[in-house]
């Protein structure tokens, strides 16, 4: 089948990086500047993506592959192929239509993106709060109150891991 197609359609012989030029007796012409064809047998070349504004060029366009963009510092990629850039916020904030806003009391965000999430409710697991939560950090749950009652095992739970210099607020 492929051999028959080649005989019937000369365009199928045009490799990636070229296009089948109808204006020139269907010969294979190189893609013009700022365009590409990633597969063979194409009748046109696609325009290269331009990484403008907050988009930065991660990979230059070539005759056989499109440019790839990422986002300038202070922004992060969203969507397939970094189709959008979204602003970063500080830890302890979330992005809203009114810009970056602090997490409400009882919620936290430990990343520069995403939304503020509620602190863990330790009591749902029958545990107590060992370290209070902040805007940037979730609470740390400790042993249940019963475990701390007189006569209970005196095994000391391991101290929670914390960032150097970070004290609970």
């Amino acid at each position: 089948f492929e051999r028959t197609r080649s005989l019937q359609d000369p365009c199928s012989n045009c490799p990636a990086g070229t296009f089948c030029d109808n204006n020139r007796n269907q010969i294979c012409s190189p893609c013009p500047p700022n365009s590409f064809s990633s597969a063979g047998g194409q009748r046109t070349c696609d325009i290269c993506r331009q990484c403008k504004g907050v988009f930065r060029t991660r990979k230059e366009c070539s005759s056989t592959s499109n440019a790839e963009c990422d986002c300038t510092p202070g922004f992060h990629c969203l969507g397939a192929g970094c189709s959008m850039c979204e602003q970063d916020c500080k830890q302890g904030q979330e992005l809203t239509k009114k810009g970056c806003k602090d997490c409400c009391f009882g919620t936290f965000n430990d990343q520069k993106r995403g939304i503020c999430r509620p602190w863990t409710n330790c009591s749902l697991d029958g545990k107590s709060v060992l370290v209070n939560g902040t805007k940037e950090r979730d609470v740390v749950c400790g042993p249940s109150p019963a475990d701390l009652s007189p006569g209970a095992s005196s095994v000391t739970p391991p101290a929670p891991a914390r960032e150097p210099g970070h004290s609970p607020q």
Epitope: G53, V54, L78, G79, S83, M84, C85, E86, Q87, L95, T96, K97
Partner: nanobody, 123 residues
Framework: EVQLVESGGGLVQPGGSPRLSCAAS????????MIWYRQAPGEKLEWVAN????????YYVDSVKGRFTISRDNATNSLFLQMNSLRAEDTAVYYC????????????????WGQGTTVTVSS
């Protein structure tokens, strides 16, 4: 081709009132949130203001509230930023950007940016 082209920048005296424009082409402006950003020399990009599809919602960064006004004219595919009482700290390159599909519902990402227009506030 989808593009945004800003204009209206230049050298402005402190207290001046330039109006920046952003001409959209290749898409229907009325379908999208639009956003102004700025980048002062040596600084990161800063969100300035945004406006929803029909102009009924407008939001501003605290430092420009009461001085800047974002508006749009969907009939002419244009976005504007009226800047009043300019200060030296408003000196920056100003960019307009298009909110991607789903902006304000599922994300606040921008998918199309202009090349920017420079506003220099100096006496």
């Amino acid at each position: 081709e989808v593009q945004l082209v800003e204009s209206g920048g230049g050298l402005v005296q402190p207290g001046g009132s330039p109006r920046l424009s952003c001409a959209a082409s290749g898409f229907t402006l009325s379908n999208y949130w639009m956003i102004w950003y700025r980048q002062a020399p040596g600084e990161k990009l800063e969100w300035v203001a945004n406006i929803n599809q029909d102009g009924s919602e407008k939001y501003y960064v605290d430092s420009v509230k009461g001085r800047f006004t974002i508006s749009r004219d969907n009939a002419t595919n244009s976005l504007f930023l009226q800047m009043n009482s300019l200060r030296a700290e408003d000196t920056a390159v100003y960019y307009c950007a298009r909110g991607g599909d789903g902006y304000s519902n599922s994300h606040y990402g921008m998918d199309v940016w202009g090349q920017g227009t420079t506003v220099t506030v100096s006496s």
